[in-house]
Interface confidence: low
């Protein structure tokens, strides 16, 4: 139903706390360089205005759209051009072009320092002094670094953060209580960020239809007892929610997500038997829980997929009558039978099925032509299964750090032109797939591995789009989303690459490395490894292992030495010489 005042409607639906949080996230995602205080001031002004509209919906400007209200606020910021350059040109446009312009200026890799966590005592002091401001800082810092973070889910993580601080700040040993818990939240939030970015990429590049197909597959796997109409309704609603969030309409997105959670909990009987524990939780936890609820038990008596989609004499007639619905039922039926497949794989199979019908239904004897389609799925299924087996075996043999290094070598050989920091970030993220997925039961490995890799590779593509340097990467990134991962996996050494000349300073280290946290030490070593591969793209695994072992030994020796500086300055050049010889 239409509301006289959209802002009053959203304020009433969401409540003040969530309203303010979402407006802060929206502003932080649009203007990523502004300080927390600047944004907090704008949020307060918008909230005060919303309250006047709640009191009187006919008050001046209350009938304006949210885009108009928010855009006007952002465009009134002083020194916009000085701080944001051409983004200021957006303010010369009218809605909806102005909002589209803001969206296009979102930066996936803003030049902001890494979000450093204060030490425990300081964190607890500022949390106790003003929990609201503390959580506001958290929302602001995460949102500006992740401009497509799923806003209602960020509110959930802030709530988790709040609960952890409330609990741990009351303990004697705050540090050992906070560190593992906050690390856990950070890891989950980072994964959530890349997954959501993938959804927004799907929506931006291929439209709602592509996202809806993804949703149908995912929901059918999770709710195999729900009928097709139910899955279609959920997929349509989920598409709307994600479209809104990806489009910067965060208040509508959060409101509609809450509505969807409410609907699911009111219709558990026709959706899934696994929803009750989620539905007993408060709103943010409920929606989060529903988004990762375990798969319902598959119906025992599902007929073979071939009956309706291969053996039926009217396959071509049914396809011609309503292509999208027929393909949708195929995707639904196949997905509900295969919770052990990745969504990417299911979409590749649906695409193959569609291509087969397009070709065969134009022939003289269609059934003879499409009769083998299910057998033709086999190579498409085997490829990711082999990928999972090979990579999980390697992970089990090498551990996470060693596995990251193996991936780093592989990807540097595939795309040596890509900047070393991007390669290291990608390899570290790709390497985490081992810890995340390879420890799961067999039937959960494939969906975990492939869908996670696809999300990480989407980020590689986004970063590469800003400064394209590798034809290999451009080729894989310009195809469809579901073909990206197989494309990257199939890449081999880039034969066109002219190796980098050997620069001694790239491999020169100083004693300050000794005091770095373990993660930072690893990044330094991995940076050196990528540079070695760029120097010798065809170096064997043995050669690289020799050099890296020597390097590790050198660091260990010098960091234990009484006079570290002297050790580094005398042993460093020897290490460089040995490296050159080993790779000659």
């Amino acid at each position: 139903e239409a509301h006289k005042s959209e802002i009053a409607h959203r304020y009433n639906d969401l409540g003040e706390q969530h309203f303010k949080g979402l407006v802060l996230i929206a502003f932080s995602q649009y203007l990523q360089k502004c300080s927390y205080d600047e944004h907090a001031k704008l949020v307060q002004e918008v909230t005060d205005f919303a309250k006047t509209c709640v009191a009187d919906e006919s008050a001046a400007n209350c009938d304006k759209s949210l885009h108009t209200l928010f855009g006007d606020k952002l465009c009134a910021i002083p020194n916009l051009r000085e701080n944001y350059g051409e983004l200021a040109d957006c303010c010369t446009k009218q809605e909806p072009e102005r909002n589209e312009c803001f969206l296009q200026h979102k930066d996936d890799n803003p030049s902001l320092p890494p979000f450093e966590r204060p030490e425990a005592e300081a964190m607890c002091t500022s949390f106790k002094e003003n929990p609201t401001t503390f959580m506001g800082h958290y929302l602001h810092e995460v949102a500006r670094r992740h401009p497509y973070f799923y806003a209602p889910e960020l509110l959930y993580y802030a709530e988790q953060y709040n609960e952890i601080l409330t609990q741990c700040c009351a303990e004697a040993d705050k540090e050992s209580c906070l560190t593992p818990k906050l690390d856990g939240v950070k890891e989950k939030a980072l994964v959530s960020s890349v997954r959501q970015r993938m959804k927004c990429s799907s929506m931006q590049k291929f439209g709602e239809r592509a996202f809806k197909a993804w949703a149908v597959a995912r929901l059918s796997q999770t709710f195999p007892n729900a009928d097709f109409a139910e899955i279609t309704k959920l997929a349509t609603d989920l598409t709307k929610v994600n479209k809104e969030c990806c489009h910067g309409d965060l208040l509508e997105c959060a409101d509609d997500r809450a509505e969807l959670a409410k609907y699911m909990c009111e219709n558990q009987a026709t959706i899934s038997s696994k929803l009750q524990t989620c539905c007993d939780k408060p709103l943010l936890k409920k929606a989060h829980c529903l988004s990762e609820v375990e798969h319902d038990t598959m119906p025992a008596d599902l007929p073979a997929i071939a009956a309706d989609f291969v053996e039926d004499q009217e396959v071509c007639k049914n396809y011609a009558e309503a292509k999208d619905v027929f393909l949708g039922t195929f995707l639904y039926e196949y997905s509900r039978r295969h919770p052990d497949y990745s969504v990417s794989l299911l979409l590749r199979l649906a695409k193959k099925y569609e291509a087969t019908l397009e070709k065969c239904c134009a022939e003289a004897n269609p059934p003879a032509c499409y009769g083998t389609v299910l057998a033709e799925f086999q190579p498409l299924v085997e490829e990711p299964k082999n990928l999972v087996k090979t990579n999980c075996d390697l992970y089990e043999k090498l551990g996470e750090y060693g596995f990251q290094n193996a991936i780093l070598v592989r990807y540097t050989q595939k795309a040596p032109q890509v900047s070393t920091p991007t390669l290291v970030e990608a390899a570290r993220n790709l390497g985490r797939v081992g810890t995340k997925c390879c420890t799961l039961p067999e039937d959960q490995r494939l969906p975990c591995v492939e869908d996670y890799l696809s999300a990480i590779l989407n980020r590689v593509c986004l970063l590469h789009e800003k400064t394209p340097v590798s034809e290999h990467v451009t080729k894989c990134c310009s195809g469809s989303l579901v073909e990206r991962r197989p494309c990257f996996s199939a890449l081999t050494v880039d034969e066109t690459y002219v190796p980098k000349e050997f620069k001694a300073e790239t491999f020169t280290f100083h004693s300050d490395i000794c005091t770095l946290p373990e993660k930072e030490k690893q990044i330094k070593k991995q940076t050196a490894l990528a540079e070695l591969v760029k120097h010798k793209p065809k170096a064997t695994a043995e050669q690289l292992k020799t050099v890296m072992d020597d390097f590790a030994q050198f660091l260990d020796t010098c960091c234990k030495a009484a006079d570290k500086d002297t050790c580094f300055s005398t042993e460093g050049p020897n290490l460089v010489t040995r490296c050159k010889d080993a790779l000659a």
Epitope: D227, A229, T270, D308, N318
Partner: nanobody, 115 residues
Framework: EVQLLESGGGLVQPGGSLRLSCAAS????????MSWVRQAPGKGPEWVSS????????LYADSVKGRFTISRDNSKNTLYLQMNSLRPEDTAVYYC????????SSQGTLVTVSS
């Protein structure tokens, strides 16, 4: 797009009969079991009857057993509900759904049983 359109409702005296129809489009009708569900004013949805895709299997709620008959014509993509010996407590909005779903994806048709 999946569409379901019910018709045939109306005002009828206790003991009277009505035949409801549900025209389906946008999906492979014969591949899916179908159901009739009703919702009385101020109450939650109540499952009435279901029929398998081929029409060979039927199920009824105890409250309508022996009085209502569900059937389908796959050549016309249409589902039917023949309602005999109607009672005042059968007053409700009747709607058809795909499978055994209780969730509404159509307008429904109002049946009022009153003298």
């Amino acid at each position: 797009e999946v569409q379901l359109l019910e018709s045939g409702g109306g005002l009828v005296q206790p003991g009277g009969s009505l035949r409801l129809s549900c025209a389906a489009s946008g999906f492979t009708f014969r591949s899916f079991g179908m159901s009739w569900v009703r919702q009385a004013p101020g109450k939650g949805p109540e499952w009435v009857s279901s029929i398998s895709g081929s029409g060979s299997d039927t199920l009824y709620a105890d409250s309508v057993k022996g009085r209502f008959t569900i059937s389908r014509d796959n050549s016309k993509n249409t589902l039917y509900l023949q309602m005999n010996s109607l009672r005042p407590e059968d007053t409700a909005v009747y709607y058809c759904t795909i499978g055994g779903s209780l969730s509404r994806s159509s307008q429904g048709t109002l049946v009022t049983v009153s003298s």
